[in-house]
Amino acid sequence: DLPQTHSLGNRRALILLAQMGRISPFSCLKDRHDFGLPQEEFDGNQFQKTQAISVLHEMIQQTFNLFSTEDSSAAWEQSLLEKFSTELYQQLNNLEACVIQEVGMEETPLMNEDSILAVRKYFQRITLYLTEKKYSPCAWEVVRAEIMRSLSFSTNLQKRLRRKD
């Protein structure tokens, strides 16, 4: 039952990300930024299940990429970062298995390239922000909160998928 697995994985990832905070977010209020989270891409009602899973996959993949950089390694406590990355990697494997399974069941799987592009552009904005802020501790703190928000949205999409089953 992938959606259930993904939900638990996301919850574990959120808890790890919550534990990763190193500085008080209240010292970073002025650094907060609207990254334009594409919330409409997490509305499971408009997608086939395969499409929704591919959006989830892109979200997790981009998060994994973001936290696998050298700059990220310097910003976070290593053991928590490794656990977080492992959790994301496991979710990617599960989602890939699920896509293969779903493609066999759906007649004409449509690729939702616009949605995937929206997710990629969202992460480009995050990366640009980090670059402009020179990967400062506050910039990473703002990004950590943003990624928690996006993971929460993907959890909600997953819950809607489970209701469709």
């Epitope: 209020l29 930024h33 609207d34 334009g36 928000r149």
Partner: antibody
């Protein structure tokens, strides 16, 4: 479902201290900031401060820095606020509230409130 | 501290009409695309309830007759059409900087 259960009414003498509790259930207590808010009878709301139960990190409204002390015991899923050197001005209802939407700092779930009455 | 001035202090609106509540901040609470202003409803003897966050986002489960707008220093809460159950005190709250503060409240009475 999410619930915040606060301790009951407290009657205290001027100069004394009181410690109130807020027991959380229905969510991961250690991963949400918890705010405390004061409301005097017939008046508005005042933000006292916030605590992160996961590591005990606190941030205070400077006005309450020497008045309130926020703590949390994760094993009991409970947040505490201690008020010291009580005066009549401290007579109020005190709410614990869960932080919502990460760094937007809104408050979604509220405890029912602890009423503190300071009287000699 | 940022002072939030709500107006009017009280208003009476007929059933089905529009209620408009204003909240003015002494300093901008908007940065990089977000306005850190939120609205709560408090009924007598109850705890406050979040209605709107980030100036215009409707909280889940809140009826669509509630709407928020504004940026910088001037914000508005609209209720239309007003229903009996909307009789309450409404508070704005900012989270633009420390300390977070609330407005003094607007009491809405339904005629």
């Amino acid at each position: 479902q999410v619930q915040l259960q606060e301790s009951g009414t407290v009657l205290a003498r001027p100069g004394a201290s009181v410690k109130m509790s807020c027991k959380a259930s229905g969510y991961s207590f250690t991963t949400y900031w918890m705010h405390w808010v004061k409301q005097r009878p017939g008046q508005g709301l005042e933000w006292i401060g916030v605590i992160y139960p996961g590591n005990g990190d606190t941030t205070y409204n400077q006005k309450f820095k020497d008045k309130a002390k926020l703590t949390a015991v994760t094993s009991a899923n409970t947040a505490y606020m201690e008020l010291s050197s009580l005066t009549n001005e401290d007579s109020a209802v005190y709410f614990c509230t869960r932080n919502y939407k990460y760094d937007y700092y809104t408050m979604d779930y509220w405890g029912q409130g602890t009423t503190v009455t300071v009287s000699s | 501290d940022i002072v939030l001035t709500q107006s009017p202090a009280s208003l009476a609106v007929s059933l089905g009409q529009r209620a408009t509540i204003s909240c003015r901040a002494s300093k901008s609470v908007s940065t990089s695309g977000h306005s850190y202003m939120h609205w709560y409803q408090q009924k007598p003897g109850q705890t406050p309830k979040l209605l709107i966050y980030l100036a215009s986002n409707l909280e889940s489960g809140v009826p669509a007759r509630f709407s928020g707008s504004g940026s910088g220093t001037d914000f508005t809460l609209n209720i239309h059409p007003v229903e009996e159950e909307d009789a309450a005190t409404y508070y704005c709250q900012h989270s633009g900087e420390l300390p977070f503060t609330f407005g003094s409240g607007t009491k809405l009475e339904i005629k």
